[in-house]
């Protein structure tokens, strides 16, 4: 069998909401993956599991099942959304993310994704992880790959 290539493209969009009383930030982060099947037979994308970390703490997880199949020598682009919550011991971030005087409230998140594919009863897992900048202060739609190398304005400690 030839390889199945998984390429994490980046953040597609991030939608923000807040709970004022709980000083909590809710970020719905949609990511884009390219999965390429280099084989001469179809493969099934059985599931995608993803998690997002902020400051070494897992702030969101998602799992998609029975996603799609990819034909021979074909590629599919898949979007998946991870709902994340920045709260509790990280509630200090609420102050930073809600500063109306700052235009871009970039925070660094680590995106981890594992894709499980199957073909002829054989299962294969491919994992990727990438640091991305996400604006926690407003709803943002990114050009693909745009969120990777932005300058990040760090909150005061």
């Amino acid at each position: 069998p030839r390889s199945i290539d998984v390429k994490y493209i980046g953040v597609k969009s991030a939608y923000v909401s807040y709970d004022v009383q709980k000083r909590t930030i809710y970020l719905n982060i949609t990511n884009t993956l390219n999965i390429t099947n280099n084989n001469y037979y179809s493969v099934e994308v059985e599931n995608i599991t993803a998690q997002v970390q902020f400051a070494k703490t897992v702030i969101g997880k998602a799992r998609l099942n029975n996603i799609t199949h990819i034909g021979p020598l074909d590629m599919k682009q898949i979007d998946y959304t991870v709902p994340t919550v920045i709260a509790e011991e990280m509630s200090y971030m609420y102050d930073f993310c809600t500063l109306i005087s700052i235009k871009v409230h970039n925070i660094v998140l680590m995106m981890q994704v594992t894709v499980t594919t199957t073909y002829f009863g054989h299962s294969e897992q491919i994992s990727q992880e990438r640091y991305q900048y996400v604006d926690c202060g407003r709803n943002t739609t990114y050009q693909l790959g745009q969120s990777e190398y932005l300058n990040v304005l760090q909150p005061q400690q």
């Epitope: 807040y18 004022v20 809600t98 109306i100 005087s101 700052i102 235009k103 304005l153």
Partner: antibody, heavy 119, light 112 residues
């Protein structure tokens, strides 16, 4: 330390226009909104609008749309206000003021530029 | 536009006295993020305004602790516990919760 240095006083004729400058130093000029505030003699303060030098984004007080145009030059770290079709009502002191990130208030002000409109 | 009403217009005080300035807004100044953007500035003759108190009650750096701010919603107060000569000037409240940003008409703190 943060400094905002404004250009000198102006005496202009009615119907003319004027451009006032505000040079910022001692901070990351491109990353802070710059505001402009009008104060007529013996009167209160009026917010004209603001500009984000990083990308030129602006927000105006509707009252000053068409009267004031805000611009900024990142390379010289200078913000400008252009006032057009001047009348006696535009005679005032104009202040630039930086919008601070963490206090979320106008925490540093220029010394003010006096504009007198007279024939 | 949000109207900011300051009282009194003029406040004659003796040095060492307490001074209290009121500021009332025509609508709530609580932002959707839960913060209240009500600031106080002081302006001395021939000078630019200076930030005194931000977000209702936070003293700006270098501001003496005889200055305090309080209030919520639409009603706010600036207090000076013991007025000193250097405190004399015009005090303005300001809101930036709503665009356009607006200022109170000012209160002149003067010596009796």
């Amino acid at each position: 330390q943060v400094q905002l240095q404004q250009s000198g006083a102006e005496l202009v004729k009615p119907g003319a226009s004027v451009k006032i400058s505000c040079k910022g130093s001692g901070y990351a000029f491109s990353s802070y909104w710059m505001n402009w505030v009008k104060q007529r003699p013996g009167k209160g303060l009026e917010w004209i609008g603001q500009i984000y030098p990083g990308d030129g984004d602006t927000n105006y007080n509707g009252k000053f749309k068409g009267k004031a145009t805000l611009t900024a030059d990142k390379s010289s770290t200078t913000a400008y206000i252009h006032l057009s079709s001047l009348t006696s009502e535009d005679s005032a002191v104009y202040f630039c003021a930086r919008w601070g990130h963490y206090d979320e208030a106008m925490d540093d002000w220029g010394q003010g530029t006096s504009v007198t409109v007279s024939s | 536009d949000v109207v900011m009403t300051q009282t009194p217009l003029s406040l004659p005080v003796s040095l060492g006295d307490q001074a209290s300035i009121s500021c009332r807004s025509s609508q709530s100044l609580v932002h959707s993020n839960g913060k209240t953007y009500l600031h106080w500035y002081v302006q001395k003759p021939g000078q630019s305004p200076k930030l005194l108190i931000y977000k209702i009650s936070n003293r700006f750096s270098g501001v003496p602790d005889r200055f305090s701010g309080s209030g919520s919603g639409t009603d706010f107060t600036l207090k000076i516990s013991r007025v000193e000569a250097e405190d004399l000037g015009v005090y303005f409240c300001s809101q930036i919760t709503h665009v356009p940003w607006t200022f109170g008409g000012g209160t002149k703190l003067e010596s009796k």
